[in-house]
């Protein structure tokens, strides 16, 4: 028998520095977790103690903190090289800055293979990107070889910016021929490493003949055997065992997200490459594990540029950005309009000729807007200014909701109007009319939404049974500010980009902004 140790991360999302337990900014160092310096300590400890070790990443290193905003992926390549990762699968967020934003900082700089079998390049891109990412890689491990085959969510064109010259195929259809190829090369130990979510990971384990282990990402799934060490609630045991269609027991693993845990899986193979046993658990990277001093010193060196960035001008406003509670919790405010416009702009994806965009709607709780920005400061907008507007470190996510759920959300928005409460919704791609003379729960008298399946966008009445895509803060997706109906009834939830980053990118792109109050939210009395 031959034993392999698989160390794995996924959905690190730019958490290069240690974080607090909830993966936000570290405020009390003695209680902080994760970060590449601490990860390196643990990885090195295991490499020294065990003979056959692979360090793998299942995608979405990109996006999540100011590190990515400033360094644009160069930080990912640099620190993953320093940690000596053995392979990485492409995640959807690796395409957030377009294909160029993946090729230059990461694909060309990484000293480890970057994988995806179901992404096929076409047109002029095919030759440009050739060899920079691979469908699979055969890695020597001790006296043996292990095949790693990659995959990426086929939803990526809706979640990021891969452009029109990359085709995202069905994962299972694309993986099978690559695994078959590995078999013909006499590679009998095969790991599928990818970024499509736990449900797809399990399907791959079940359907793709020849895959021995699945290491996944995208769904931030926490698996654990025994008593979990922190707040994450396990979705199942680690590893999660799937019985394949050809009768094999295939371990499936994921390691939550944000570099909080290091996945640790021990696999025993027989001489024919069959899995005899698998066991392990994610390792919580808490403060009992010291940060490696040389990596920490490097982090501190790279940090300097971030501190300077906070006060640099991103763009200018020539109007007052009204983010006051007196406005944003009572009526349409232009800060709400700005943020919603940025949220939609961040999700522009021309993936289908029938649709001008896949999503047109944004909702945003007025209580999440915490500061105005005065244009009389030379119009300057900095990251620091935006951090005062959006101080809670959330993300702007993509959800799918029925029209009936949206209607309930808008009724909740004004069910106790006038008390300066945070649930009053700011909007984009939506025209809503409220009649406050009616009883709570029956105050929405008109709700029109911007079409997506159209060449000329126009507003149509909301249909109760139709499924709509909406961009909103993760706080609302999780039921915050009383929006329990969103949490309970959402049909799909994909986590998105850091809130401040979305707005800062938009302002940098527009250079000069002048959002208006333009009749997205209206109040009326009487009949309609």
């Amino acid at each position: 028998a031959w034993e392999l140790t698989i160390l794995h991360t996924n959905d690190v999302h730019s958490r290069l520095e240690q974080t607090s337990e909830d993966s936000s900014k570290c405020v009390n160092a003695s209680r902080c977790m994760g970060g590449v310096a601490r990860l390196f300590t643990k990885v090195q400890q295991i490499r020294r103690a065990e003979p056959n070790v692979l360090l793998l990443d299942a995608g979405d290193q990109y996006q999540g903190t100011i590190w990515f905003t400033v360094y644009k992926g160069a930080e990912v390549a640099h620190f993953m090289n320093a940690l000596r990762y053995d392979a990485m699968a492409l995640g959807n967020h690796e395409f957030d800055n377009g294909v160029e934003g993946l090729i230059e900082p990461l694909l060309k700089e990484a000293k480890f293979p970057i994988l995806s079998a179901n992404i096929k390049a076409k047109g002029p891109l095919a030759s440009q990107i050739s060899g920079l990412y691979l469908p699979y890689k055969v890695l020597p491990v001790g006296d043996e070889v292990v095949g790693i085959v990659g995959y990426t969510s086929k939803e990526t064109p809706f979640l990021s910016n891969p452009g029109t010259n990359l085709v995202f195929e069905d994962e299972i259809t694309a993986l099978q021929p690559e695994v078959d190829k590995l078999k013909t090369l006499n590679v009998n130990k095969i790991i599928a490493l990818g970024h499509s979510g736990f449900e797809m990971d399990k399907l791959i384990a079940q359907k793709v003949r020849g895959v021995d282990v699945v290491v996944g990402g995208h769904s931030n799934t926490f698996l654990y055997t025994g008593n979990p060490p922190s707040k994450e609630v396990p979705a199942g045991k680690y590893p999660f065992i799937v019985t394949s269609d050809d009768g094999r027991k295939v371990p499936v693993v994921q390691a939550y997200a944000f570099g909080k845990y290091l996945g640790y899986l021990k696999i025993e193979f027989d001489e024919r490459g069959n899995v005899i046993s698998s066991h392990g658990n994610p390792i919580l990277l808490n403060s009992s594990i010291p940060e490696d001093p040389s990596i920490k010193a490097d982090i501190n060196k790279w940090r300097i540029k971030l501190d300077n960035y906070s006060t640099q001008e991103l763009g200018k406003t020539i109007v007052y950005l009204d983010g006051s509670s007196q406005s944003c919790r009572f009526r349409e405010c232009n800060m709400g309009n700005l943020i919603c416009d940025a949220m939609i702009n961040n999700n522009l994806r021309h993936t289908d000729e029938m649709f001008w965009n896949h999503v047109s709607m944004c909702i945003l709780n007025g209580g999440g807007i915490r500061s105005p920005i005065d244009e009389r400061n030379n119009g300057t907008i900095t990251w620091e200014n935006l951090a005062a507007v959006l101080p809670f470190g959330g993300t702007f996510d993509l959800v799918q909701l029925k029209g009936s759920t949206l209607k309930k959300a808008f009724e909740h928005s004004v069910h106790r109007y006038g008390q300066s409460t945070g649930e009053f919704l700011q909007v984009g791609g939506i025209h809503v009319v409220y009649d406050l003379s009616r009883k709570p729960g029956d105050r929405v008298v008109k709700l029109d939404v911007l079409c997506t399946k159209c060449r000329v966008p126009s507003y149509d009445p909301l249909k109760m049974d139709e499924v709509y895509k909406v961009i909103l803060p993760n706080f609302l997706a999780n039921g915050g500010d009383g929006f329990q109906m969103i949490k309970d009834e959402l049909l799909r939830h994909d986590s998105g980009d850091q809130d401040i980053n979305v707005v800062s990118t938009y302002i940098s792109k527009m250079k000069v902004i002048y959002p208006a109050v333009e009749g997205r939210i209206k109040f009326s009395t009487g009949s309609h």
Epitope: S324, S371, S420, G479, Q484
Partner: antibody, heavy 117, light 105 residues
Framework: EVQLVESGGGLVQPGGSLRLSCAAS????????MHWVRQAPGKGLEWVAV????????YYADSVKGRFTISRDNSKNTLYLQMNSLRAEDTAVYYC??????????WGQGTLVTVSS | IQMTQSPSSLSASVGDRVTITCRAS??????LAWYQQKPGKAPKLLIY???TLQSGVPSRFSGSGSGTDFTLTISSLQPEDFATYYC????????FGQGTRLEIK
Amino acid sequence: EVQLVESGGGLVQPGGSLRLSCAASGFTFSSYDMHWVRQAPGKGLEWVAVMSYEGSNKYYADSVKGRFTISRDNSKNTLYLQMNSLRAEDTAVYYCATEIAAKGDYWGQGTLVTVSS
Amino acid sequence: IQMTQSPSSLSASVGDRVTITCRASQGISNYLAWYQQKPGKAPKLLIYAASTLQSGVPSRFSGSGSGTDFTLTISSLQPEDFATYYCQQSYSTPHFGQGTRLEIK
């Protein structure tokens, strides 16, 4: 590190006044609504007052309305509670706390106010 | 809005499953939090938005409910869980329940 440190507690006679302070550090104080909560010896928690992050809204428990005033100075990262016409039943440990936001809340360790003749 | 917690005290053993309930005098949607307090210490947030587990809180704690009836459940009591528990609504001006003292049997 996030810290809320209350001060200004002590012994005061019935009818007297005290001003409590709460010094905040380690987070964006000006972005959070702030509360005062108290706990009489051996009793449960009682909410006292709240002030919105930018200072435009203040609300009080009925038991302190007209006697207590909450205020804040965002430039000094400090929350205040001016307590007038104090009564024996105001004897308690007074805590300052942030609102529950997307990441939860923060509390101080409390300051003891004793109203006795 | 008044909050009524029950029971006011409870004896249980390590490993037990414990449930504490809280009833609001009128509907509060999911604007409900649960706190744990130990003698001489500030309260510690366990659950907010009725069912969202606060960072750093063990997963044996869970919250449920919406509207007027809410529940805090501890799936398997640990020695450090013996304390007083409070619910608090933040739908209107905040109000705490009277507390539930959880003691070792």
